[in-house]
């Protein structure tokens, strides 16, 4: 999906209003310095591409993020403010339902959500030059 036509300001407002708090809740008990940010993004469409990938694509050691509250809200925000996003996700959602596993918070998941927090922060500051 090409995120170029999303309403970035609305997605930012949704993040600041509620998604950010759910990410913090997920990470509660973890020190903010515990993980290094290794995933970056260069502009808002790129950030949303990386956020989608990290939130919804299962990775080795962390297959369970898609049913977390922050993930459901992220999916809803993209569906509302990215024209045509919902239609592209129908097949992906059906595949995800088939392989759904019970929710387990592993260290790998915590690391992944820490990366997500970094991507969201970058999304909210699009005019900053990349280091």
């Amino acid at each position: 999906y090409d995120f170029t036509n999303c309403d970035f300001e609305k997605i930012k407002a949704a993040y600041l209003s509620t998604i950010s708090k759910d990410l913090i809740t997920y990470m509660s008990g973890t020190k903010s310095t515990e993980f290094n940010n290794t995933v970056s993004c260069s502009n808002r469409p790129h950030c949303l591409t990386e956020i989608q990938s990290l939130t919804f694509n299962p990775t080795a050691g962390c297959a369970s993020l898609a049913k977390e509250m922050f993930a459901m809200k992220t999916k809803a925000a993209l569906a509302i403010w990215c024209p045509g996003y919902s239609e592209t996700q129908i097949n992906a959602t059906q595949a995800m339902k088939k392989r759904r596993k019970r929710k387990v918070t592993t260290n790998k998941c915590l690391e992944q959500v820490s990366q997500l927090q970094g991507l969201w922060r970058r999304f909210n500051r699009p005019l900053l030059k990349q280091q």
């Epitope: 209003s17 809200k73 809803a76």
Partner: nanobody
Framework: QVQLVESGGGLVQAGGSLRLSCAAS????????ITWFRQAPGKEREGVAY????????YYADSVKGRFTISSDNAKNTVYLQMDSLKPEDTAVYYC?????????????????????????WGQGTQVTVSS
Amino acid sequence: QVQLVESGGGLVQAGGSLRLSCAASGFTFGDYAITWFRQAPGKEREGVAYISNFDGMTYYADSVKGRFTISSDNAKNTVYLQMDSLKPEDTAVYYCAAEGRMGTHSRDSVYFWAFSALYDYWGQGTQVTVSS
């Protein structure tokens, strides 16, 4: 240009009823979500009730569930808030607000409808005072 005009506020005794109206113009009413917010002195603006003019889906704040009813008349481009069993704590300025994408995505909007930062257009507000 876009306009939202609220009316129907006033002074009422606890246990009484009021019906607020929000008349809209300047946008495609049938695609929009309209939400009633309220703001009491010294408090944050609070989402009270949401309706999608696209499919009629409604959401309510827990504090008003069973007492307030939101409805829409697409022919008149007007949304109503019927407020029954009013309490002193319902005293506030009531605003209606409109958003263009949450109307056509009402199921996904369950997470976001009550957040004022997401709305594009606002009315000037109408005062509701409930005396004990």
